[in-house]
């Protein structure tokens, strides 16, 4: 059994989340995971519910009788989704950290933003990729 | 020549964002982009990068003079990112609009930590993956 | 109250242009994708076109690639066809369709106007 | 390219229950909304089911709409059918590039 089971548990308690009514009105993420098959898909939406966990524990960082569960699960977390790799991790933080409010940080991402949107489909990694994509899309007006 | 340049470069003049000591101190995102070449890795990545922009993009909504600029950015950003996959679009919303601090979303988010930990890496989906996986990374304590 | 109206269907011959339009009322025209949709006497819906709201964004059929096109004007909120080229397959009723969300095109319809009828025969 | 299979024809007496459904040759089902519009004689579509199976206003509660991961399918349900029901029926969704209608299903009421 991974570790993080035994102090998920140890966390139920403490959140009084192992009640059944805990499930009414529907699941956060499990739902959301089932619909998606595709290991980009995946990612995607598990990188949302990953920074959602990590936001949760920072706001309970202080709580000592939580803290060696918590722990272990970001642990084994960083496992699991950055596959031990620091680089992974420490770019999703500094991501996850960037202030929407911050005008700096506001001037940069909009500086950013052509190279940022040239970068998102897959089919801009590779010219064949797009060509086909397009020929199967239909032409866009502004090409 | 696709629709979000002309609208980016919009967004640049409102933001003051097209000059030179923008990119002073690094960039935001092209760097983190640039580390990854894996597509589930960028997706990991593009994930936050995309939320970030929404979250920015909300900020300004009722701002007029750059309400069509946004507007055009976020289409082409749902057709390159989303793949114009609504069903997509929404259950990231879903998991972007989730508030860390609500009661009942964290018993929910604890509830279900198991299961979604259980998912999160590949190698939950096919046995030799984890095989190979495990033989990479050598024993766990707990294995 | 959302309303579409389609025009400027009618008989062509083959290899002849035609031009639809579709005046929309009720919503923010400017906010949301438009697509055509046809369906040819008795059989079954056919997706067509569709354009963003901006109308930077146009997509089309393999169908009907390289002979129709697209485009809007968004303060007339009205939305076109154009067809060059036609074929006696085109012959369908043509509906102009609204998207079901703003941020489109995301191909799901929630409002579709009457129709015009668009005959290619010699 | 995907398709959607749905049933020619159905029919069912007034009061009964009709379920119409719509299988997807490849790709999964729950990874794309599916739409269900109904067309009454010489009229133009309008939306019974949207996002699945969420419900326009004005549309009776008798409709509903629904996902089978397990036959990769959807369905919709009429209940408590009406004469006014009878209309041709057709699912939608969409995928990569690919708009895709099913073949359409003729609801008869006897």
């Known amino acids: 059994q991974d570790p993080y089971v035994k102090e998920a548990e140890n966390l139920k308690k403490y959140f009084n989340a192992g009640h059944s009514d805990v499930a009414d009105n529907g699941t956060l993420f499990l739902g959301i995971l089932k619909n998606w098959k595709e290991e980009s898909d995946r990612k995607i939406m598990q990188s949302q519910i990953v920074s959602f966990y990590f936001k949760l524990f920072k706001n309970f960082k202080d709580d000592q009788s939580i803290q060696k569960s918590v722990e272990t699960i970001k642990e084994d977390m960083n496992v699991k989704f950055f596959n031990s790799n620091k680089k992974k991790r420490d770019d999703f933080e500094k991501l996850t950290n960037y202030s929407v409010t911050d005008l700096n940080v506001q001037r940069k991402a909009i500086h950013e933003l052509i190279q940022v949107m040239a970068e998102l489909s897959p089919a801009a990694k590779t010219g064949k990729r797009k060509r086909s994509q397009m020929l199967f899309r239909g032409r866009r007006a502004s090409q | 020549q696709d629709p979000y340049v002309k609208e980016a470069e919009n967004l640049k003049k409102y933001f003051n964002a097209g000059h030179s000591d923008v990119a002073d101190n690094g960039t935001l995102f092209l760097g983190i982009l640039k580390n990854w070449k894996e597509e589930s890795d960028r997706k990991i990545m593009q994930s936050q990068i995309v939320s970030f922009y929404f979250k920015l993009f909300k900020n300004f909504k009722d701002d007029q003079s750059i309400q069509k600029s946004v507007e055009t950015i976020k289409e082409d950003m749902n057709v390159k990112f989303f793949n114009s996959n609504k069903k997509k679009r929404d259950d990231f919303e879903k998991l972007t609009n989730y508030s860390v601090t609500d009661l009942n979303v964290q018993r929910k988010a604890i509830h279900e930590l198991i299961q979604v930990m259980a998912e999160l890496s590949p190698a939950a989906k096919t046995g030799k993956r984890k095989r190979s996986q495990m033989l990479f990374r050598g024993r766990r304590a707990s294995q | 109250e959302v309303q579409l109206l389609e025009s400027g269907g009618g008989l062509v011959q083959p290899g002849g242009s035609l031009r639809l339009s579709c005046a929309a009322s009720g919503f923010t025209f400017s906010s949301y994708a438009m697509s055509w949709v046809r369906q040819a006497p008795g059989k079954g819906l056919e997706w067509v076109s569709a354009i963003s709201g901006s109308g930077g964004s146009t997509y089309y059929a393999d169908s009907v690639k390289g002979r129709f096109t697209i485009s809007r004007d968004n303060p007339k909120n009205t939305l076109y066809l154009q067809m060059n080229s036609l074929r006696a397959e085109d012959t369908a009723v043509y509906y102009c369709a609204k998207d079901l969300t703003v941020g489109g095109p995301w191909y799901y319809f929630d409002y579709w106007g009457q129709g015009t009828l668009v005959t290619v025969s010699s | 390219n995907f398709m959607l299979t749905q049933p020619h024809s159905v029919s069912e007496s007034p009061g009964k229950t009709v379920t119409i459904s719509c299988t997807r040759s490849?790709?999964?089902?729950?990874?794309?909304?599916v739409q269900w519009y109904q067309q009454r004689p010489g009229s133009a579509p309008t939306t019974v089911i949207f996002?699945?199976?969420?419900?326009p206003s004005g549309v009776p509660g008798r409709f509903s709409g629904s996902l089978d991961s397990s036959s990769n399918s959807a369905s919709l349900t009429i209940s408590g059918l009406q004469t006014e029901d009878e209309a041709d029926y057709y699912c939608?969704?969409?995928?990569?590039?690919?708009?895709?209608f099913g073949g359409g299903t003729k609801v008869t009421v006897l």
């Open positions: 996002d699945d199976d969420q419900r």
């Open positions: 939608q969704s969409y995928d990569s590039s690919n708009v895709v």
């Open positions: 490849s790709g999964s089902i729950v990874s794309n909304y």
